[in-house]
Amino acid sequence: ESGYAQNGDLEDAELDDYSFSCYSQLEVNGSQHSLTCAFEDPDVNITNLEFEICGALVEVKCLNFRKLQEIYFIETKKFLLIGKSNICVKVGEKSLTCKKIDLTTIVKPEAPFDLSVVYREGANDFVVTFNTSHLQKKYVKVLMHDVAYRQEKDENKWTHVNLSSTKLTLLQRKLQPAAMYEIKVRSIPDHYFKGFWSEWSPSYYFRTPEINNSSGEMD
């Protein structure tokens, strides 16, 4: 028996699918870490549902999440970052579903920023540079970056380049002349930590030069 026979809402709740996913962001605000969880089913009625994390915490056994519309969120210095925490969906004192997760295996880096492309006429190439806040961090310093670019008219024809540095050179001859390109970049943990791709950086747009007919090169 559920122990909630008097409460139809809670009985119904036990039939629902409370699958959820979470990601952590380490040193996202100074030395503070964050943990964000959300239900995989966007139609779950979250009115009475709370999230709680227990274990692998500093000086406290459990912490409650704050609810921010459809997501649940914690920002704290109290993640031990060693061992697994138990993250549970709760109604009152009753746990509906739980997951044991090591927060260092669900890291989502912050999105790269300051993406720019500079054309070098003499070298006939484009130098792509961007920045990441992770260069200054103590923990998640080593990232793999995914630079994606496409000709603006090609809706889904993205070309991807993986790199560990924050600088990439694109050869002019590999790009179409006199074309508008869109480029963006995202990051994923690549050393010790595991997790997910960051959000994409804001896109940067650049135009390739025309072909110089006499030499067959772009202007």
């Epitope: 061992g83 697994k84 044991k100």
Partner: antibody, heavy 117, light 111 residues
Amino acid sequence: QVNLRESGGGLVKPGGSLRLSCAASGFTFDDSVMHWVRQAPGKGLEWLSLVGWDGFFTYYADSVKGRFTISRDNTKNLLYLQMNSLRAEDTAVYYCARQGDYMGNNWGQGTLVTVSS
Amino acid sequence: NFMLTQPHSVSGSPGKTVTISCTRSSGSIDSSYVQWYQQRPGNSPTTVIYEDDQRPSGVPDRFSGSIDSSSNSASLTISGLVTEDEADYYCQSYDFHHLVFGGGTKLTVLC
């Protein structure tokens, strides 16, 4: 079934070095936090060190900090404890332990280290 | 840094109940989980209680753990004592990333 087997113990002179190994099987080693704990003859348990699943995080008791180094090789399912500048008071049975979902669910059988001239 | 203090020894007759205490010297006993380990003579430790009051599978329900905030201590209670319960028992908690063990309690089952 979970199995942890320590090796590398023995007799060593004060100031000497020793490297302990712990071979793990029966569980997902590269998912587990691992510890070293020791027990001097007739005494209680003393925690020495831990290493995170990936080797990034390592922590030590003050009594061994700077002398002992914990490490792991996830490709071989091996945990190590490199012990330098050994002293008579380091004489003990050394256990490796798997944290799993909680510390100490699984312990090895221990290996005896004797530091004596 | 804190210490965990246990009585040096306790004893009880078969079938009786004994309780072993584990008192935290500073900071709240509520601030991190407590584990209990049993170590029979010549053997490795095994976990009998984790996360204050949880029993690993295979540990009989005669073993129970509790926390008492007012005395800032944890307790291991063993009911229906049997001779195989004779062993050393250690409590353990966390000080940030460090593990802290109590000094151990020798349980003697009187015949």
